[in-house]
């Protein structure tokens, strides 16, 4: 099995951006890797974003994705933008070694991301 590590807790900044590292221990020499961020709230699991990349190349999410990221070896630096207080929850990093065979899947324990909406600026007379 493939071990995936990620931080237990991350606090989003005042602009609603949270970053964390997802690191995996590859059992083989993968050339194609897929990274997915899943959000678990209660018993519901939803896909936040996903990207497939070739080892040594840049991580590319879809244009409309709220995620960006960079990869370095067996480490992926993930950034999620546009978060609001209601998005506070457990964000799980899933890593799949897609090619060459054999396929491997690894799932992290999740990063609890806390998002605090900024206080609106008081009106100034």
């Amino acid at each position: 099995a493939m071990h995936v590590a990620q931080p237990a807790v991350v606090l989003a900044n005042s602009r609603g951006t949270a970053s964390f590292v997802c690191e995996y221990a590859s059992p083989g020499k993968a050339t194609e890797v897929r990274v997915t961020v899943l959000r678990q709230a209660d018993s519901q699991v939803t896909e936040v974003c996903a990207a497939t990349y070739m080892m040594g190349n840049e991580l590319t999410f879809l244009d409309d994705s709220i995620c960006t990221g960079t990869s370095s070896g067996n480490q992926v630096n993930l950034t999620i933008q546009g978060l609001r207080a209601m998005d506070t929850g457990l964000y799980i990093c899933k890593v799949e070694l897609m090619y060459p065979p054999p396929y491997y899947m690894g799932i992290g324990n999740g990063t609890q991301i806390y998002v605090i909406d900024p206080e609106p600026c008081p009106d100034s007379d």
Partner: antibody
Framework: QVQLVESGGGVVQPGRSLRLSCVAS????????MHWVRQAPGKGLEWVAV????????YYADSVKGRFTISRDNSKNTLFLQMNSLRAEDTAVYYC???????????WGQGTLVTVSS | EIVLTQSPGTLSLSPGERATLSCRAS???????LAWYQQRPGQAPRLLIY???SRATGIPDRFSGSGSGTDFTLTISRLEPEDFAVYYC?????????FGQGTKVEIK
């Protein structure tokens, strides 16, 4: 709700071909790996093949490698299994199954029976 | 290939009794990637347990899973009439995906 409906099964002679289809609904098809699993009469479950997300990556059981081809059409939410050079031992109920976000096969179709007999 | 061996092959019990099913792997697997399925006669398999111990949506709490490494267990605390079926374990952490040969739980 999630639904998977297989079709295309039937009786076919050894050496001939058959194409199975599985139409999916109720979820984002392209976000899931899709599998074919078969069950010979009175026997257990045997994984056959998987196709990932955009359809580029595929894996097969050794027993069908070189004879079966899995494919998908994400625009039509449909999974396919092209079965060539069929043998008597391929006789089984064929199920399509969705790979859940955490990996297990969380939804299954009702199955379609393929009988290879002369 | 990871081989899964289930025991016993058949379990003869009465409604209300406790059922304990075993699944042994030929090599150590992460508990994150062990599932149990139920298959009633003439029906498709249904996911019961994933990650060795997490119940799938809508599965009653009389079903529980445990284990790690190479030894895993499915427990049905009190058998209901609809629980008499065949149960399969499966590993899904690496290819090829493999199933155990099944345990049939039948009415005594």
């Amino acid at each position: 709700q999630v639904q998977l409906v297989e079709s295309g099964g039937g009786v076919v002679q050894p050496g001939r071909s058959l194409r199975l289809s599985c139409v999916a609904s109720g979820f984002t098809f392209s976000s899931h790996g899709m599998h074919w699993v078969r069950q010979a009469p009175g026997k257990g479950l045997e994984w056959v093949a998987v196709i990932w997300y955009d359809g580029r990556n595929k894996y097969y059981a050794d027993s069908v490698k070189g004879r079966f081809t899995i494919s998908r059409d994400n625009s039509k939410n449909t999974l396919f299994l092209q079965m060539n050079s069929l043998r008597a031992e391929d006789t089984a109920v064929y199920y399509c199954a969705r790979g859940g976000h955490f990996g297990p096969f969380d939804y299954w179709g009702q199955g379609t029976l393929v009988t290879v007999s002369s | 290939e990871i081989v899964l061996t289930q025991s016993p092959g058949t379990l003869s019990l009465s409604p209300g009794e406790r059922a304990t099913l075993s699944c042994r792997a030929s090599q150590s697997i992460s508990s994150s990637f062990l599932a149990w399925y139920q298959q009633r006669p003439g029906q498709a398999p249904r996911l019961l347990i994933y990650g060795a111990s997490s119940r799938a949506t809508g599965i009653p709490d009389r079903f529980s899973g445990s284990g790690s490494g190479t030894d895993f267990t499915l427990t049905i605390s009190r058998l209901e009439p609809e629980d008499f079926a065949v149960y399969y374990c499966q590993q899904y952490g690496t290819s090829p995906w493999t199933f155990g040969q099944g345990t049939k739980v039948e009415i005594k």
